[in-house]
């Protein structure tokens, strides 16, 4: 039950963020023109990942696609591609995911199959939301270092009477919900997996009791129970014999000396 | 069609308040903003705030103490408020439309002559 | 705040000559997101009040006759008549439409001999 709630639960949250990452995508403001110690202009500039806008005061808003691919800075494309990879690796995830879910059965699915499944959309996510954060991380850098470089700007060159104003950029919206969306898909990935270590079906190997009639003495090896949970491991319960210590899948059983009295 | 009309005191005496209205038809206080914009007698235009569609407001520096600008959209009304007059204060007081683009003031009103004098 | 500067403060033509009058900003009216400079042209006919003539410094006005061109960017702008008639008599006003507070300049006086 708990491993179902925690694989749900992990694909809602995964769900959301990778909502928000396509979100934070395709919102304008990636960089909003700062407003603080700078003079009022009637017109307000932000500016996404594929266009810019001008919204006047009047409420009028102009916004420009970034027509060029060669002409944009390698840091925005390298941005773009980082938020479209996330994308692309949340989606696969999402598909993988819905098959793996616990609560829907699809034909005779093993549950092997299913944790496989679970952990590989759980990894897929993981990753989406690292490509996430790191898309907006590397903009949000390149955001500081342009605002530091256009406030020295501002105050040199400045000789004569006629100022010039350079617009300054500051964090937008799509920032943090670029950032806190690819936190949700990294959480919903990392709750994927722990999900897929609890439907991995267990592997119990049962050290059986081998009886050795050699004369009137019993040999008894009591051999315990082996558990364990391994991702694609064989699910098979093996019988362990003392006799050379071989598996019954390894060897067929040959009549031996010890074998009858 | 689109008309804006000033209406205020006509003589004040200084260091008292004033309010101009300007009463707008042909198009709506809540899509559009509205400026005021004064010309002493023989003189220039001084511009001296507006308000936004949205209700937000902005002056001019000069005069931001004493003046402020609030309307009321059901009536189609806008109004400036002036405080301690003076005689400098004289002049034609224009409410006119903000246009849609580039900022500029599309359609503007006749006018209000404002005296300052005791 | 923002000064505007207007030259000449008058000038008389005759119908149908071409007529140019400058404005100039003490600050760049030039918004980098759009490449629009943000200076707005009016002409005031005496006993009347202001009417809009050119806005984003070289786009006409609805109405406005083709005559009434706007150039210009930055600091400086121009406002050219290419054959002035005896109705252009006016004032004209450019105005910063890009800082708050908008501010006017002084005007030019345009007279028909």
């Known amino acids: 039950m708990a491993v179902t709630a925690c694989q749900g639960l992990g694909f809602v949250v995964s769900l959301i963020g990778i909502a928000g990452i396509i979100a934070a995508t395709c919102m304008d403001q990636w960089s909003t023109q700062d407003l603080y110690n700078n003079p009022v202009t009637a017109v307000f500039n932000y500016q996404g990942l594929w266009r810019s806008c001008v919204r006047e005061s009047s409420g009028f808003t102009e916004c420009r696609g970034y027509f060029t691919l060669l002409g944009l800075p390698a840091m925005l494309q390298a941005v773009r591609a980082l938020m479209i990879v996330g994308i692309v690796l949340g989606a696969i995830g999402l598909l993988v995911s819905i098959f793996a879910l616990k609560c829907i059965r699809i034909g005779s699915m093993e549950d092997s199959a299913k944790a496989n499944m679970t952990l590989t959309s759980g990894i897929m996510f993981i990753v989406s939301g690292l490509c996430a954060i790191a898309g907006v991380s590397v903009f949000a850098n390149m955001l500081v270092t342009n605002f530091w470089m256009s406030t020295a700007n501002m105050y040199t060159g400045m000789g004569g009477m006629v100022q010039t104003v350079q617009t300054r950029y500051t964090f937008g919206a799509a920032l943090f919900v670029g950032w806190v969306a690819g936190g949700l898909t990294l959480i919903g990935g990392v709750m994927m997996c722990i999900a897929c270590r609890g439907l991995a079906p267990e592997e119990t190997n049962y050290k059986a009791v081998s009886y050795h009639a050699s004369g009137h003495s019993v040999a008894y090896k009591p051999g315990g129970f082996k558990a364990s949970t391994g991702f694609g491991s064989n699910t098979k319960n093996k019988k362990i014999y003392d006799g050379g210590a071989r598996t019954e899948d390894e060897v067929q059983s040959y009549p031996s000396k010890h074998d009858y009295v | 069609q689109v008309q804006l009309k000033e209406s205020g005191p006509g003589l004040v005496a200084p260091s008292q308040s004033l309010s101009i209205t300007c009463t707008v038809s042909?198009?709506?206080?809540?899509?559009?903003?509205v400026h005021w914009v004064r010309q002493p007698p023989g003189k220039g235009l001084e511009w001296l705030g507006v308000i936004w569609a949205g209700g937000s407001t902005n002056y001019n520096s000069a005069l931001m103490s004493r003046v402020s600008i609030n309307k009321d959209n059901s009536k189609s009304q806008v109004f400036i408020k002036m405080n301690s007059l003076q005689a400098d204060d004289t002049a034609l007081y224009y409410c006119a439309r903000a246009a849609y683009y580039g900022n500029g003031l599309d359609y503007w009103g006749q006018g209000t002559t404002l005296t300052v004098s005791s | 705040d923002i000064v505007m500067t207007q030259s000449p403060s008058s000038l008389t033509v005759t119908a149908g000559e071409k007529v140019t009058m400058s404005c100039k900003s003490s600050?760049?009216?030039?918004?980098?997101?759009?490449?629009?400079?943000?200076l707005t042209w009016y002409q005031q006919k005496p006993g009347q009040p202001p009417k809009l003539l050119i806005y984003?410094?070289?786009t006409g006005e609805s109405g406005v006759p083709d005559r009434f061109t706007g150039s210009g960017s930055g600091t400086d702008f121009t406002l050219t008549i290419s054959s002035v008639q005896a109705e252009d008599l006016a004032v004209y006003f450019c105005?910063?439409?890009?800082?708050?507070?908008?501010?006017f300049g002084g005007g030019t006086k345009l007279e028909i001999k």
């Open positions: 984003w410094a070289s």
């Open positions: 600050q760049t009216l030039l918004n980098s997101g759009n490449q629009k400079n943000y």
């Open positions: 042909g198009f709506s206080l809540t899509t559009y903003g």
């Open positions: 105005q910063n439409a890009y800082f708050y507070p908008f501010t």
